[in-house]
């Protein structure tokens, strides 16, 4: 089968790499805007060059194109906890990040917030945080995980999913119990 | 079919409290992120919070950090969200709304919303 080409891939593909067909006379290829350009004005015919302007302050484009205008430049969203890595270039766009110590969780293929790195307080680092990824923790004894954070088994209700973890803990409290009673 | 049915709206004076739910069907519940947006009379859509698969991440709006809490129950696929302190700024229609996974919105789903009316 076949891929289905959009409209504008395959006017482009009869042109060879670097080059796109004019839109109104489809027997000229003209040559493509660098990054960092946009397209003003196709080229007046074979051979001859495109007009190709330099994007405005906000915007940019990062590969080579025929846009009619630039991109506008992404803003970190410091509602987010976002920081610019690198601001926009003309060829770039935003980078954005996180501060040290802490790491992203993707809401959405986009979207994404920075969250602090877990300590492991009660515990011992399993696997350094990372970029995308949080610190997986691995609990001292008489300490269950929740929530990527190590909790004193005296927190342990049985109807949790902690009381195989703290069992023996659970045990000892029943232990006591059951020698008081006698 | 994707069905968000929030309720829990309503009148309450400033300072006042309210619970919003959120009812989710013709979907896997606990493979996605959730959240509730809202709109104010004559203004645009504001995210309010979101909350993880696992309840592990969320997010709050500055504007209402410290007074909403955002929690779901995943065996009854629902979602909630307490509201406490309440101003008269908080009024506006909230909708509930499933986050999309790809793609360059954060929601892809919408509630019919709930009416928050806050006024003494």
């Known amino acids: 089968l076949v891929p289905h080409l959009g409209d504008r891939e395959k006017r482009d593909s009869v042109c060879p790499q670097g080059k796109y067909i004019h839109p109104q006379n489809n027997s000229i290829c003209c040559t493509k805007c660098h990054k960092g350009t946009y397209l003003y004005n196709d080229c007046p015919g074979p051979g001859q060059d495109t007009d190709c302007r330099e994007c405005e302050s906000g915007s940019f484009t990062a590969s080579e194109n025929h846009l009619r205008h630039c991109l506008s430049c992404s803003k970190c969203r410091k509602e987010m906890g976002q920081v610019e890595i690198s601001s926009c270039t003309v060829d770039r766009d935003t980078v954005c990040g996180c501060r040290k110590n802490q790491y992203r969780h993707y809401w959405s293929e986009n979207l994404f917030q920075c969250f602090n790195c877990s300590l492991c307080l009660n515990g011992t680092v399993h696997l350094s945080c990372q970029e995308k990824q949080n610190t997986v923790c691995t609990c001292h004894a008489g300490f269950f995980l929740r929530e990527n954070e190590c909790v004193s088994c005296s927190n342990c209700k049985k109807s949790l999913e902690c009381t195989k973890l703290c069992l023996p803990q659970i045990e000892n409290v029943k232990g006591t119990e059951d020698s008081g009673t006698t | 079919e994707v069905q968000l049915l929030e309720s829990g709206g309503g009148l309450v004076q400033p300072g006042g409290s309210l619970r919003l739910s959120c009812a989710a069907s013709g979907f896997t519940f606990t493979r996605y992120s959730m959240g509730w947006v809202r709109q104010a009379p004559g203004k645009g859509l504001e995210w309010v919070s979101m909350i993880d698969v696992g309840g592990r991440h969320t997010y709050y709006a500055d504007s209402v950090k410290g007074r909403f809490t955002i929690s779901r129950d995943n065996s009854k696929n629902t979602l909630y969200l307490q509201m406490n302190s309440l101003r008269a700024e908080d009024t506006a229609v909230y909708y509930c709304?499933?986050?999309?996974?790809?793609?360059?919105?954060?929601?892809?789903?919408w509630g019919q919303g709930t009416l928050v009316t806050v006024s003494s």
């Open positions: 709304a499933k986050i999309s996974q790809f793609g360059p919105n954060a929601f892809d789903y």
